[in-house]
């Protein structure tokens, strides 16, 4: 268990042209606040449960009113840190989202409105217990400067907060197999409660309830020796059962060096050889210059010769973000067909298909007519996930099983009488009307609204509607 701490140093206009307008005015004073979301792993858009590592909302900052005509300065910030407690192990690699919100203090109905000024995201490597790491992120014309660290809550220690420390029981030394807790030299590493039955000599655990075997031992409880050849280790307490030297825990076990650093033992402790761009006792510090390699995924870093000057990452195709940390949203290519909803889960694309469609990209139009018969000569028409029958003349209903009454809809206008006929319906028009549905009035002089009556039919005669 531990706490991730975020300290916002400044939020204001970034370098370069196009300085943003001040977000507050005399008519509409406002104040800023921040929210951070943390997720384990590499992708800030990963599809875990929301903010799986935790989230925090800052206090509101001081009320700010723009001075007329003045450019937007760095805006007044809330006091204090944003703290995100984490219950389990610190993952070492994490993704963050920091939102900068403005709360408007004008006369709004239902309370002040919120406006999202900037949203930055990235992924970082960080060992718990190390010093503050500094960062600069840009969002549009705004620039956010901040520091962050992860620290363990006692009794947890270590780069992942998985080791536990307890006060020494004896004044001079720790118990067998237990090391002093650097930097708390007056405390000893406490054994975790491992899986029941886990061999106290040959097994250990880094998480409660597990049983991991020392070299040369195997089995679910680490009670089975692998072979005598594994007894040649130069270090460790002697095993009472076999006479083998079983490796005891050493300072480099679990590699305390973060960010790809390599560990070597020294007489008193360990030493990390850090890759370019990282430094510190455990290679956990990054000062965010181009020398530190802040651009992910092969991005090219330009400028930023010292920690206080800005750098720019030129991203390779397929990546974006101020540190090239964001994969281009593959959903923007609209891969889901037939109106499917695209979800970019980070590790995969998923399409949620509309009814009637299926397949990884909703490319398959489900055969709604499969196994469905339309009676009485009807033909099946598919679409939208539901089959429909186009019925032969004289039939209706979902499956064309019902004999249709063509007169049910009262198709004959102006009081005409309807007669069902084998080929449809026939309207017998009231005096003064004619047409297939009696829709045309006959004019008093004998002319009708039709150009001419069809040959062989007088106005008033029944007209067959074909």
């Amino acid at each position: 268990a531990g706490v991730f701490e975020l300290q916002i140093h400044s939020f204001g206009p970034g370098p370069g042209p196009g300085a943003p307008r001040s977000p507050c005015s005399a008519r509409l004073p406002c104040r800023l606040f921040f929210r951070v979301c943390l997720k384990p792993g590499l992708s800030e858009e990963a599809a875990e449960s929301p903010c799986a590592l935790g989230a925090a909302l800052s206090a509101r900052g001081p009320v700010y009113t723009e001075q007329p005509g003045a450019p937007a300065p760095d805006l007044p910030l809330p006091d204090g840190l944003l703290q995100v407690p984490f219950r389990d192990a610190w993952p070492g690699t994490f993704s963050f989202i920091i939102e900068t919100w403005r709360e408007e203090l004008g006369d709004q109905i239902g309370g002040p409105a919120w406006s999202l000024l900037a949203r930055v995201a990235g992924r970082r490597r960080l060992a718990a217990g190390g010093p503050w790491a500094r960062d600069i992120q840009r969002a549009g014309a705004w620039e956010l400067r901040f520091s962050y660290r992860a620290r363990c809550e006692p009794p947890a220690v270590g780069t992942a907060c998985t080791r536990l420390c307890r006060p020494r029981s004896a004044p001079s030394r720790c118990g067998p197999g237990l090391r002093p807790c650097a930097p708390l030299e007056d405390e000893c590493e406490a054994p975790l409660v491992c899986r029941a039955g886990c061999s106290p000599e040959h097994g250990f655990c880094e998480q409660p309830g597990e049983c991991r075997c020392l070299e040369g031992w195997t089995g679910p409880l680490c009670t089975v020796p692998v072979s005598t050849s594994s007894c040649l280790s130069p270090r460790g307490p002697s095993s009472a059962t076999t006479g083998c030297l079983v490796p005891g825990p050493g300072p480099c076990d679990g590699n305390p060096c973060a960010n790809g650093g390599s560990c070597s033992e020294t007489p008193r402790s360990f030493e990390c050889t850090c890759p370019r761009g990282f430094y510190g006792l455990r290679c956990e510090v990054s000062g965010v210059t181009c020398a530190d390699g802040p651009c992910f995924n092969g991005g090219l870093c330009v400028g930023g010769a010292d920690p206080d000057s800005a750098y720019i990452c030129h991203c390779p195709p397929g990546f974006q973000g101020s540190n090239c940390e964001k994969r281009v949203d593959r959903c923007s290519l609209q891969p889901c067909r037939n109106g499917g909803l695209c979800l970019d889960l980070g590790h995969a694309l998923r399409c949620r298909c509309r009814a009637g469609f299926a397949g990884p990209r909703c490319e398959h139009d489900l055969d709604d007519c499969a196994g469905r018969a339309c009676a009485n000569g009807g033909t099946c028409v598919e679409g939208g996930g539901a089959h429909r029958c186009s019925c032969a003349l004289g039939f209706g209903g979902r499956d064309c099983r019902e004999r249709a009454d063509p007169c049910a809809a009262r198709p004959c206008a102006h009081g005409g009488r309807c007669y069902a006929h084998f080929s449809g319906l026939v309207c017998a028009c009231a005096p003064g009307y004619m047409g297939a549905r009696c829709e045309f009035p006959v004019h008093p002089d004998g002319a009708s609204a039709l150009p001419a009556a069809p040959p062989g039919l007088r106005p008033g005669d029944p007209q067959r509607y074909l």
């Epitope: 929210r35 858009e45 909302l57 939102e99 239902g110 919120w114 999202l116 949203r119």
Partner: nanobody
């Protein structure tokens, strides 16, 4: 399970107005943040704004300030996006999304934080 259905999209001239609706079925919508995202061709899905879960207050992205307003009718389980002074760069598919998170403060601006989504409605601003 909450089903969301957007409506009200269409073609409108620059400077015109549209009102989008998001009808929720399945649960009481008042317990959810109900927000709008939009996605233009070749772009990421972008937060537009909406109403928070706990007190219904409006939240919006800075680029739509003064032009778009968000409201909800809890009795009808429906959220609304009133879009005025529309510009060609507002052209996109507009999606409604809902979730019970976060329990306080403004709604999240990140698509991955939302469990429930509609299928979207196309808004085209063109002369």
């Amino acid at each position: 399970e909450v089903d969301l259905v957007e409506s009200g999209g269409g073609l409108v001239q620059p400077g015109g107005s549209l009102r989008l609706s998001c009808a929720a079925s399945g649960r009481t919508a008042s317990r959810y943040s109900m927000v709008w995202f939009r996605q233009a061709p070749g772009q990421e899905r972008e937060f537009v704004g909406g109403n928070s879960a706990h007190d219904g207050r409006s939240a919006y992205t800075d680029s739509v300030k003064g032009r778009f307003t968000f409201s909800r009718d809890n009795a009808k389980n429906t959220g609304y996006l009133q879009m005025n002074s529309l510009r060609p760069d507002d052209t996109a598919v507009y999606y409604c999304a809902a979730d019970t998170n976060p329990p306080y403060g403004p709604p999240w601006s990140t698509p991955s934080e939302y469990e429930y989504w509609g299928h979207g409605t196309q808004v085209t601003v063109s002369s």
